[in-house]
Amino acid sequence: AGVFELQIHSFGPGPGPGAPRSPCSARLPCRLFFRVCLKPGLSEEAAESPCALGAALSARGPVYTEQPGAPAPDLPLPDGLLQVPFRDAWPGTFSFIIETWREELGDQIGGPAWSLLARVAGRRRLAAGGPWARDIQRAGAWELRFSYRARCEPPAVGTACTRLCRPRSAPSRCGPGLRPCAPLEDECEAPLVCRAGCSPEHGFCEQPGECRCLEGWTGPLCTVPVSTSSCLSPRGPSSATTGCLVPGPGPCDGNPCANGGSCSETPRSFECTCPRGFYGLRCEVSGVTCADGPCFNGGLCVGGADPDSAYICHCPPGFQGSNCEKRVDRCSLQPCRNGGLCLDLGHALRCRCRAGFAGPRCEHDLDDCAGRACANGGTCVEGGGAHRCSCALGFGGRDCRERADPCAARPCAHGGRCYAHFSGLVCACAPGYMGARCEFPVHPDGASALPAAPPGLRPGDPQRYL
């Protein structure tokens, strides 16, 4: 058992032209976090199961806001290591995927939005207990600098964390046949329980008597490198010492295939058979397939198993992005009509409609006047999700049921007195004024300024408003 540790040193624009835009802005401040996924190197089983060695998520980094006009600098990083504990032997060869995620901290409804900024992948050979290994990986215009190591958890030691150490029974030396445990010199190696002769460097066991080989080693005692040439090689002079044909130089010598690819000669040159997740002439290009589990938030992955295969993620409602990594604020599209209130419930959208409207998007204007009668000869007028009555003369109120006081609004001008009448109102004008509302002054010479009084009606007499 042990722990794989990853230290991110920097994440920022890579060298060369085409510097990426800062992922954060004054309007949308954000912070970064990282995800690491580990798989054992050449294991077929592990290639199918995502992150079979383990995975880890970093803490969130400090909030970052872009300075307008400034180029994107290295972005502020989360504190601490990413640690991936492993329970069994350290495999020696492993694949990694490191993802850089952005958490947007704007005023998103429903919480922050996450989006994948960059993803790097690779395959490495690494002995447990060794020093930190430094690496630089590029993803598009971004560059990620990091270090990693694998360390054993006591009592395990060794390059695969398979040898066990115990405190010394005697103060001065270890028991017969047992070595001190480097670097824990005050402890001794526990008695071996593996098959006798099993290589302590390249083999390990989980049960007494067995000898299981690390990646790249074979044979009953894990002492034979997988790449050892066969004595049946068709080229080269015979070796006097071994009787084997020693291979001459060939296109596969030195193995031009990267990332654990295996080389085979062709009539003209060589061909690399790449492990899952890598492709290219020399297996130098790393690819992501559905086997890597790239779809988030319940997205379904569509694609083939070959490293060259594309993939797409079929996203559930409420998520978008090439990996379904971004939450959609579906209410920002203002789907509710007629002033309805939008509610994003995650699994569905709901519109809460104003009075007088209905339908999934409040698109139906209800017939406000249906079944509503206006009393006393009033007529119903629709509008704005509510009905109102236009009342006949002498009536008022919501349904025209109330008798109106026509004098309440003081309709008679210039001090005229108002009288309610069955057909409306009558104004008794003050001296010097005339008209239905006492609105016209009577001129001193006796001639009215405006319409002449009808015959038989003297100025000053009450005038009925008809």
């Epitope: 379904l300 797409i312 993620c313 079929h314 996203c315 559930p316 998520f319 978008q320 992005g321 090439s322």
Partner: nanobody, 115 residues
Framework: EVQLVESGGGEVQPGGSLRLSCGPS????????VGWFRQAPGKQRNLVAG???????NYAQSVKGRFTISRDNAKNTLYLQMSSLRAEDTAVYYC?????????WGQGTLVTVKP
């Protein structure tokens, strides 16, 4: 049962172009993820190009810059424009669509690239 029907396959010389069509079909709607798979003799079936239900497009590394996938939701049709064709592009090309419940496949159309 509703089927997807491909057309546009055939024989072409290296460097040539072809345009594959799939549909029209009521299956090809904007709420579905759609794509083109291909299968060469003795090989696995792999996604060449796809468009997800949220509009993200992706291509196999070997066809990037040469193939273009597009969909016409009004015509319920999916297209694959293939140019600069190579011998290794020879395969049966299958139209594909899916929603959360179902997957739909076409019968395939053969594309042969040879001098």
């Amino acid at each position: 049962e509703v089927q997807l029907v491909e057309s546009g396959g055939g024989e072409v010389q290296p460097g040539g172009s072809l345009r594959l069509s799939c549909g029209p079909s009521e299956i090809i709607t904007s709420d579905k993820s759609v794509g083109w798979f291909r299968q060469a003799p003795g090989k696995q079936r792999n996604l060449v190009a796809g468009i997800s239900n949220v509009g993200s497009t992706n291509y196999a590394q070997s066809v990037k810059g040469r193939f273009t996938i597009s969909r016409d939701n009004a015509k319920n049709t999916l297209y694959l424009q293939m140019s600069s064709l190579r011998a290794e592009d020879t395969a049966v090309y299958y139209c594909y669509a899916r929603d959360f419940e179902n997957e739909y496949w076409g019968q395939g159309t053969l594309v042969t690239v040879k001098p």
